[in-house]
């Protein structure tokens, strides 16, 4: 047994451009809190798989109100560690999910509103009893800095918290077969605590709570001898004629204990040792109440005021499962364009784009302009899977390599005549019109419609469009 400890150092904008908007405002002050979820082994970090190693919620942080005009700073954090107790051995390799939640403190009907601000996930190797490990994770434009460690709860020691230590009974040395406990040299490694009732003569254990039998003995508690003589049937009553004692069906066969309970034989029947949150003869009853906070992801817990009444989690949009622990498959709507691969990271959807595409939804076609230059001062414009050049005046064609006839599009209005010019085109306007494209009528009184003709140009003069 032991405790995983998580210390959040900072949560704020990450480096680089695109600083995130502050999650709080003067109109909607808010505060942060964190949730950590641990899973054994290098398992997938999917939000919907249960936090088999445990989970914990932090306290709420101080109330934060954005200062208008100021850049989003590191946000004020809750005090203290997040602690996830583990009952069995520390697995050494684990996966984690750390969620940053925002609690808005405005005048919402029905109390404060929660929303997930960021989720980071990772897989790590960690020995119990080691020093604090530091980590930095980014989620979008946010950055989370934290440290973590796993420590054993006495009397457990070791990198997996499976060895047990006791104070020395004698000052000089430990008992037979027992070593000193490093780093606690004044303590001795203690025998493991096997399953309750495990035969001290015929059983042993390598992990706390188990009971493994020496050769010649069987049964959950290693109390049943196995005959090596002429017993033919592997199961059945004892045979008086052969002197065989063959165990009959045991009450723990097939493990009648539900929800991960462990079965122990008793003189009359069996007994289930239930994990936390379950009880009943076969651990079939959930003892979790709404006070235990069983609903994840902002789910609302209803009922379950006492261990005898069931609770129900009403999940917010986007979550499902009996504890709101499963995320709806938002990727099934296929939001990624151009063949991009959709990843649901919880706090956001991400698209992994195929080569040649970019953008949050792979909407930008990089191949349009990659390795292609537009000639004669043209600029490349992305779009639609085919590159397009916006050509400088006097040039046209796909790559701006062709000399364009600037008058081909008949740019001069109201019957104006177009002349190609080295720097573009010139319109000679018909009487009564003026402007670079002859677009402005000249009023009968000699005044022109806005904009006025530049000084030095009379209405009707050819005007060069620059």
């Amino acid at each position: 047994a032991g405790v995983f400890e998580l210390q959040i150092h900072s949560f704020g904008p990450g480096p680089g451009p695109g600083a995130p908007r502050s999650p709080c405002s003067a109109r909607l002050p808010c505060r942060l809190f964190f949730r950590v979820c641990l899973k054994p082994g290098l398992s997938e970090e999917a939000a919907e798989s249960p936090c088999a190693l445990g989970a914990a919620l932090s306290a709420r942080g101080p109330v934060y109100t954005e200062q208008p005009g100021a850049p989003a700073p590191d946000l004020p954090l809750p005090d203290g560690l997040l602690q996830v107790p583990f009952r069995d051995a520390w697995p050494g390799t684990f996966s984690f999910i750390i969620e940053t939640w925002r609690e808005e403190l405005g005048d919402q009907i029905g109390g404060p509103a929660w929303s997930l601000l960021a989720r980071v996930a990772g897989r790590r190797r960690l020995a119990a009893g080691g020093p604090w490990a530091r980590d930095i994770q980014r989620a979008g434009a946010w950055e989370l800095r934290f440290s973590y460690r796993a420590r054993c709860e006495p009397p457990a020691v070791g990198t997996a918290c499976t060895r047990l230590c006791r104070p020395r009974s004698a000052p000089s040395r430990c008992g037979p077969g027992l070593r000193p406990c490093a780093p606690l040299e004044d303590e001795c490694e203690a025998p493991l605590v096997c399953r309750a009732g495990c035969s001290p003569e015929h059983g042993f254990c390598e992990q706390p709570g188990e009971c493994r039998c020496l050769e010649g003995w069987t049964g959950p508690l290693c109390t049943v001898p196995v005959s090596t003589s002429s017993c033919l049937s592997p199961r059945g009553p004892s045979s008086a004629t052969t002197g065989c004692l063959v165990p009959g069906p045991g009450p723990c066969d097939g493990n009648p204990c539900a929800n991960g309970g462990s079965c122990s034989e008793t003189p009359r029947s069996f007994e289930c040792t239930c994990p936390r949150g379950f009880y009943g003869l076969r651990c079939e009853v959930s003892g979790v109440t709404c006070a235990d906070g069983p609903c994840f992801n902002g789910g609302l817990c209803v009922g379950g005021a006492d261990p005898d009444s069931a609770y129900i989690c009403h999940c917010p949009p986007g979550f499902q499962g009996s504890n709101c622990e499963k995320r709806v498959d938002r990727c099934s709507l296929q939001p990624c364009r151009n063949g991009g691969l959709c990843l649901d990271l919880g706090h956001a959807l991400r698209c992994r784009c195929r080569a040649g595409f970019a953008g949050p939804r792979c909407e930008h076609d990089l191949d349009d302009c990659a390795g292609r230059a537009c000639a004669n001062g043209g600029t490349c414009v992305e779009g639609g899977g085919a590159h397009r050049c916006s050509c400088a005046l006097g040039f046209g064609g796909r790559d701006c390599r062709e000399r364009a006839d600037p008058c081909a599009a008949r740019p001069c209005a109201h019957g104006g005549r177009c002349y190609a010019h080295f720097s573009g085109l010139v319109c000679a306007c018909a009487p009564g019109y003026m402007g670079a494209r002859c677009e402005f009528p000249v009023h009968p009184d000699g005044a022109s419609a806005l904009p006025a003709a530049p000084p030095g140009l009379r209405p009707g003069d050819p005007q060069r469009y620059l």
Epitope: R330, Q334, P335, L349, P360, R361
Partner: nanobody, 120 residues
Framework: EVQLVESGGGEVQPGGSLRLSCAAS????????MGWYRQAPGKQRELVAG???????KYAESVKGRFTISRDNAKNTVYLQMSSLRAEDTAVYYC??????????????WGQGTLVTVKP
């Protein structure tokens, strides 16, 4: 903030028809993908029909030929025309949209759901 408002749910007999609509409003720059999910009691939420990010339509196998999704881009609205309804279509139908906000961020939004009940 973006709101998705569904309407059109109700009770209908097997073989009957219903038309659901979902209107998106708020600080929307563009709608990237939009569609309908449903969740029957005790079941996972599943996509029924939708317009994908590439603009194509997608249908669940169980509704092909019976349901038709359409949209009105000017009104930021999608519709689900449901015909030949069966008892197994009974569920809460949720509108969902992947939206590009005015801030240029993309966010995924859900409606509150509308109940469709098919029973004789």
């Amino acid at each position: 903030e973006v709101q998705l408002v569904e309407s059109g749910g109700g009770e209908v007999q097997p073989g009957g028809s219903l038309r659901l609509s979902c209107a998106a409003s708020g600080s929307i720059f563009s709608i990237n993908a939009m569609g309908w999910y449903r969740q029957a009691p005790g079941k996972q939420r599943e996509l029924v029909a939708g317009f994908t990010g590439d603009g194509s339509t997608k249908y669940a196998e169980s509704v092909k030929g019976r349901f038709t999704i359409s949209r009105d881009n000017a009104k930021n609205t999608v519709y689900l025309q449901m015909s030949s309804l069966r008892a197994e279509d009974t569920a809460v139908y949720y509108c969902a949209a992947d939206v590009q906000l005015l801030s240029s961020d993309y966010e995924f939004y859900w409606g509150q759901g509308t109940l469709v009940t098919v029973k004789p």
